[in-house]
Interface confidence: low
């Protein structure tokens, strides 16, 4: 009969910029040689050629040189395709066509995803707020895919649906920046939270702002920084916000601004004698020179590293002086967990198996939760280890030992406590005897 070609039923989810494997397998007959094999990968809808193997040779990538086969595994029936540096435009269905004596094909879906950044919150107006004032709160989250769902709520968790305007704009790579605007009338004080959800990654990113209307005290220079830590993703740029109120007639010649590490007093950046004296912090800091005259003393920290985490002091001296400290909390999202099973062949009910859940390059340390198909937590026989690499990013490996029932689903959830990002993987073990991953 026709050749049976097997691919995963569920879409393959791949993060933008990572590599994805589109699994495809067939059952080679005894005496099969690669000279007999014709393998074609193509886009299902357009029939565009992606990669091929014919006449005993890999014919190479026809898809922007970003695809590869697994040549050493072809003879065993593994026709999987590696797609490198995944882009949004890659999303869709790929057909794996295998011809030996007979032929067969199957289509595998690629679902592309990108985590949304922790939302940044801005307030307009942001000074001299009094109860009864109308304010516009903007929640912005960047570079995610697919389009996000946005939810607002107040400090009591009550959803806020009125006066919300949400817009999502795709950039040239197809990644979305989401901006959601809430207009509210201030009470005596209030907390407003914005949650940005990635429906594919089931990743929730949220931020909140607490507004306490009050009059500013007079006297010394009042230096204002955010109460909450600034959360920055590793490798991105962070703005440590700091502002002061310039008096009428203020000129930059009067300003002395010093940023330093709070604990060690190490100089980070300074502006004195009317001039930006530059970065003393690995050339990764910058001020906003055009905004200094308006009282914006914020610091831009580029290419954030785990080692940057901590407290930074903003010291402003004009005639009087003042200072305030802002905390930088560094974070990195955990990758979608990969699941492995040991043993992974000929499994029968009653067998003890070890399921390993691995998630990579996150920060800070993750919380790991296991549960069964009914959502019941599995806490016994779990060993979780987290190792930091030289950049301080953690790889987490959690091992669950279970005795198999007739069938069962085991889910692992890796939570980033700072980003409030949940990444999860699951494995379903059914039937007997069985093999994992399923073989052709």
């Amino acid at each position: 009969g026709a050749l049976e070609v097997q691919v995963p039923e569920d879409p393959v989810v791949a993060l933008v910029g990572t590599d994805a494997t589109l699994c495809c397998s067939f059952s080679p007959e005894p005496g099969f040689s690669l000279a007999q094999l014709n393998l074609i990968w193509q886009l299902t809808d357009t029939k565009q050629l992606v990669h091929s193997f014919a006449e005993g040779q890999d014919q190479g990538s026809a898809y922007a040189n970003r695809t590869a086969l697994f040549p050493d595994l072809l003879a065993q029936g593994n026709a999987s395709l590696r797609l490198q540096r995944v882009r949004v435009a890659d999303e869709g269905s790929f057909t794996c066509f295998v011809s030996i004596r007979d032929f067969g094909s199957a289509a595998v879906s690629l679902q592309v995803a990108a985590p949304y950044s922790k939302p940044s919150m801005t307030l307009e107006p942001n000074k001299d707020l009094r109860p009864g004032d109308t304010v516009t709160i903007t929640c912005s989250s960047y570079q995610g895919y697919p389009e996000a769902e946005v939810f607002w709520q107040d400090g009591q968790g009550v959803p806020l649906t009125g006066n919300v305007t949400t817009s999502q704009m795709a950039n040239e790579q197809g990644l979305f920046d989401v901006h959601s605007i809430l207009r509210v009338v201030l009470g005596a004080n209030g907390t407003y939270s914005c949650l940005v959800r990635n429906p594919v990654l089931q990743q929730d990113a949220h931020s909140s702002v607490t507004i306490t209307p009050q009059r500013s005290p007079t006297g010394a220079v009042e230096v204002q920084v955010p109460e909450d830590p600034v959360v920055a993703l590793v490798g991105t740029d962070a703005t440590l916000r700091c502002s002061f109120s310039p008096e009428p007639g203020f000129s930059l010649a009067q300003l002395n601004l010093i940023w330093q590490l709070t604990d060690t007093k190490q100089l980070v950046h300074s502006f004195t004698e009317g001039r930006d004296q530059g970065s003393a912090y690995a050339n990764r800091t910058a001020l906003f020179p055009d905004l200094l005259a308006q009282g914006n003393a914020s610091l831009r920290l580029q290419r954030v590293r785990v080692a940057d985490e901590g407290s930074f002091t903003c010291f402003v001296s004009i005639r009087d002086f003042g200072s305030a400290a802002v905390s930088l909390q560094v974070a990195a999202p955990y990758s979608k967990p990969s699941m492995t099973l040991e043993p992974n062949k000929d499994l029968r009910p009653g067998d003890t198996v070890t399921i390993t859940c691995s998630s990579y390059r996150g920060y800070p340390e993750a919380e790991v939760f296991w549960q069964d198909g009914q959502g019941v937590p599995l806490t016994g026989n779990v060993t979780t280890s987290q190792m930091a690499n030289e950049q301080g990013l953690f790889d987490v490996h959690s091992v669950l030992r279970v005795v198999l029932g007739a069938n069962g689903t085991y889910s692992c959830l890796v939570r980033n406590p700072v980003l409030q990002q949940d990444a999860h993987g699951s494995v379903t073990i059914t039937g007997q005897p069985m093999t994992f991953p399923p073989e052709a």
């Epitope: 590599d19 490198q84 540096r85 290419r303």
Partner: antibody
Framework: QVQLVQSGAEVKKPGSSVKVSCKAS????????ISWVRQAPGQGLEWMGG????????NYAQKFQGRVTITADESTSTAYMELSSLRSEDTAVYYC???????????WGQGTLVTVSA | EIVLTQSPATLSLSPGERATLSCRAS??????LAWYQQKPGQAPRLLIY???NRATGIPARFSGSGSGTDFTLTISSLEPEDYAVYYC???????????FGPGTKVDIK
């Protein structure tokens, strides 16, 4: 402290191949780009190609395409550059270099002199 | 393939003088441009990355500027240890392919 240590000098015959190694210590090997740059006697710097070990992707200058192969062994934190079909004009000092973040080469190996002579 | 041209080929200056080295790309390289210094018998040393950022440990007398196709390395006041060959290097966005310029030799007048 990041260090790149290259293999020793080589004398090769025209038409043969040479494989130079570059062992990295300090920093996470996989996360940085490794470049290979050569310099013929009295000449300028010439970028041959590079690899990002974590991706396993090598890129080559057009001039060397098909003649150079750059690989990386993450388990030993070692990068390799193999140049085939050697000719006398390939006589040069070959350097490996590594970035601090991104691509720019902050750290360089000590150089390996390859002499191609009949 | 992007070609880099450096001028002048040789710059003869006295200590304390200002050195201005130019690098021109055959097409725009945004700010993906680095400057390296090389002394005889030594490996090159990164001075400037992303057109204008000083690398760690590089003295403030070195500065870089420019974007697109025209870039400048300035040494505000030459020190004896600055006499060397200076190379500019560009990087394409993806794939990351690099090209060096032919170099400018700064020697003592």
């Amino acid at each position: 402290q990041v260090q790149l240590v290259q293999s020793g000098a080589e004398v090769k015959k025209p038409g043969s191949s040479v494989k130079v190694s570059c062992k990295a210590s300090g920093g996470t090997f996989s996360s940085y780009a490794i470049s290979w740059v050569r310099q013929a006697p009295g000449q300028g710097l010439e970028w041959m190609g590079g690899i990002i070990p974590i991706l396993g992707i090598a890129n080559y200058a057009q001039k060397f395409q098909g003649r150079v192969t750059i690989t990386a062994d993450e388990s030993t934190s070692t990068a390799y550059m193999e140049l085939s079909s050697l000719r006398s004009e390939d006589t040069a000092v070959y350097y490996c270099a590594r970035g601090d973040s991104g691509y720019d080469s902050n750290y360089w190996g000590q150089g390996t002199l390859v002499t191609v002579s009949a | 393939e992007i070609v880099l041209t450096q001028s002048p080929a040789t710059l003869s200056l006295s200590p304390g003088e200002r050195a201005t080295l130019s690098c021109r790309a055959s097409q725009s390289v945004s700010t993906y441009l680095a400057w390296y210094q090389q002394k005889p018998g030594q490996a090159p040393r990164l001075l400037i990355y992303d057109a204008s950022n000083r690398a760690t440990g590089i003295p403030a007398r070195f500065s870089g500027s420019g974007s697109g196709t025209d870039f400048t390395l300035t040494i505000s006041s030459l020190e004896p240890e600055d006499y060397a060959v200076y190379y500019c290097q560009q990087r394409s966005n993806w794939p990351p392919l690099f090209t060096f310029g032919p170099g400018t030799k700064v020697d003592i007048k």
